[in-house]
């Protein structure tokens, strides 16, 4: 037999096995020009010493073979003895190591068998009614195709599916969408309506994320508030990466899960912008305010479940220079200015009340005054901090108030509102004999003592009603008792107590009269 012809004799090796895991497979035969044809196949297993034979049976009932040697591709003309206008059955037999393995056969009309390409280029993936829709441009001059897909997950083998007949410039396929695992898809095409035409090669992998992006499992820690009034949010644990099928490992466009960090600054609600979304890799600096932080995972199908944390406000108060002066027109606060053209947010809320009851005021951008101070004033009519109770005040500053991550904490402190000097007056002053020349003076704690750092000291005043001599005794803010000594028996005294703040003298309590009885000895 001539090598260019199909040989109508017995092949030069024993009968073929019925097929095994190794051996020839994926036989494809096409017309490649007006009079030339090509068959190609793949061989699974060791290739040393393997001889391949392309077998062909004609509709007449005669069978022949081409010897391909070690090659897995063979071309022949329409003069090779194979009828190209009628149906033929072709398969490959491979002779190696004293055994013959055969491929599955293809039955086709060679003349009408055009080499079909798999979907080429961009395969668009979208979600449609809980299924996956893939769409691609039909390869040039190949309208009219049957399309199949195969898909696998990281833990399952390939499963085959059918896309049905296609007859347009764009082709599409509906495929199953997995809820929680990534999938790898491949597509192949063959000529529609051409009996037994060969399938194209499989397309490049299409990597598809699960419908639900994985819930982020991350942990945060927040550093201490620095001198600049900012603290760094750090990621303690990276989100787990999605497990990918074999063909999607490495570069797998389509399966990416994006993690975004959504910050919601709860403090200072009167500012312009309360939320900001950042990439998870870019960990922000925060002020000492309270925040809600959400990590949102999303993939090409949209966002998934998110994980939310609450970052409490930094309640570390400093004995800072917040100066408050109360005048007839109203109240003014002074504090060391941060920089030029800063916007300040002053937030206050009654101590012991829900954080949701915080009130705040935003200043216009201001420069420091000649003494380097920033100020905020309000009138009595505004009602701000007007009640006689303890308020927690926080002042935030930003040169760019529209940018959530550029706020810093200037100070946090306590302030007693309303008429503090009167409201702080100690009550229930009582005097008890202590010794022959001393008494113990007790009083109920001032309301100011409920406000950390506000009460500077108590002052106890003792007045000798005879000589009109007055003595004053400072008492630590934590004490509510003092012993007055060096008193004379039979003399009338009055005692009063007041509570002072750093910036305000208190109002004296009602005078309490007492005297030490003259002791008569027997």
């Amino acid at each position: 037999c001539r090598t260019s012809e199909c040989c109508f004799q017995d092949p030069p090796y024993p009968d073929a096995d019925s097929g095994s895991a190794s051996g020839p497979r994926d036989l494809r035969c096409y017309r490649i020009s007006s009079d030339r044809y090509e068959c190609s196949w793949q061989y699974e297993g060791p290739t040393a010493g393997v001889s391949h034979f392309l077998r062909c049976c004609l509709s007449s009932g005669r069978c022949c073979y081409f010897a391909a040697g070690s090659a897995t591709r063979l071309q022949f003309s329409d003069q090779a003895g194979v009828s190209v206008l009628y149906t033929v059955t072709l398969w490959v037999e491979s002779w190696a190591r004293n055994q013959t393995e055969k491929s599955p056969e293809v039955t086709l009309q060679l003349y009408n068998s055009v080499k079909y390409e798999p979907p080429l280029g961009d395969i668009k993936v979208s979600k449609l009614a809980g299924q996956l829709r893939m769409e691609w441009e039909t390869p040039d001059n190949q309208v009219g195709a049957e399309v199949q897909f195969r898909h696998r997950t990281p833990s399952s083998p390939w499963k085959l599916g059918d896309c049905g007949p296609q007859d347009d410039d764009t082709e599409s396929c509906l495929c199953p969408l997995e809820m929680n695992v990534a999938q790898e898809f491949q597509l192949r095409r063959r000529q529609l309506g051409s009996q037994g035409s060969s399938w194209s090669k499989w397309s490049s992998p299409v990597c598809v994320p699960p419908e639900n992006p994985p819930q982020p499992q991350v942990r945060f820690s927040v550093e201490q508030l620095g001198q600049d009034g900012r603290r760094r949010l750090t990621l303690k644990e990276q989100p787990t990466q999605l497990e990918l099928p074999e063909g999607c490992q490495g570069l797998a466009p389509g399966t990416e899960v994006t993690y975004r960090l959504q910050l919601h600054m709860l403090s200072c609600p009167c500012k312009a912008k309360a939320t900001r979304t950042l990439h998870l890799g870019k960990m922000p600096y925060l002020s000492g305010a309270a925040y809600n932080v959400a990590v949102i995972s999303s993939n090409q199908f949209g966002p998934g479940l998110n994980q939310t944390w609450h970052i409490p406000a930094d309640t570390h108060t400093e004995p800072v220079a917040l100066n408050i002066s109360v005048g007839t027109n109203g109240t003014t606060m002074y504090w060391p200015a941060r920089a030029q053209s800063m916007t300040y947010c002053i937030e206050w809320q009654p101590v012991g009340q829900d954080g949701g009851l915080a009130t705040c005021s935003l200043t216009a951008p201001q420069d420091p005054d000649p003494a380097g101070m920033a100020t905020y004033s309000w009138s009595r009519e505004s009602g701000a901090m007007g009640q006689e109770k303890c308020y927690y005040i926080t002042i935030f500053a930003s040169a760019h108030p529209e940018k959530l991550t550029l706020w810093s904490t200037v100070l946090s402190t306590y302030h007693f509102g309303g008429n503090a000097s009167a409201a702080g007056t100690p009550h229930h002053v009582s005097v008890k004999n202590h010794s022959l020349d001393s008494v113990s003076v007790d009083w109920a704690p001032s309301l100011l003592s409920t406000c950390p750092g506000v009460l500077k000291e108590y002052v106890v005043r003792c007045r000798d009603e005879d000589s009109k001599q007055v003595s004053e005794h400072p008492v630590q803010p934590t004490e509510t008792q003092v012993t007055l000594s060096g008193l004379r028996a039979g003399v009338a005294y009055t005692v009063q107590v007041r509570a002072d703040t750093a910036w305000l003298r208190g109002v004296w309590s009602q005078p309490q009269r007492f005297s030490i009885e003259v002791q008569v000895s027997d």
Epitope: D10, D15, R55, G61, R62, C63, K102, E105
Partner: nanobody, 111 residues
Framework: EVQLVESGGGLVQPGGSLRLSCAVS????????VNWYRQAPGKQRELVAL???????KYADDVKGRFTISSDSAKNTVYLQMNSLRPEDTAVYYC?????WGQGTQVTVSS
């Protein structure tokens, strides 16, 4: 001269088995398609199974899983192993290759 000779037919009970042989001369079973046909009384001849080039086997739907076609190239013979036989398998079984036919062998399935 091409000749095909069938043998192995007979009477068998439903559920039983038979093995038909087709001895071929003049052509090689490895370089041709050998078919088994059958014809029941009053019916048209129908293809039961075929073997192409001694390797590729095809079956009619109603015998799939019950009948097996095979070949022995050394003896140049094709076989049809018939299991789980049914009364409706009763027919004359013919072997053919190219345009040549054998004389047939009778298979009767009856209790």
């Amino acid at each position: 001269e091409v000749q095909l000779v069938e043998s192995g037919g007979g009477l068998v009970q439903p559920g039983g088995s038979l093995r038909l042989s087709c001895a071929v001369s003049g052509i090689s079973v490895r370089s041709s398609v050998v078919n088994w046909y059958r014809q029941a009384p009053g019916k048209q001849r129908e293809l039961v199974a075929l073997i192409m080039g001694g390797a590729i086997r095809k079956y009619a739907d109603d015998v799939k899983g019950r009948f097996t076609i095979s070949s022995d190239s050394a003896k140049n013979t094709v076989y049809l192993q018939m299991n789980s036989l049914r009364p409706e398998d009763t027919a004359v079984y013919y072997c053919s290759a190219l345009e040549y036919w054998g004389q047939g062998t009778q298979v009767t399935v009856s209790s």
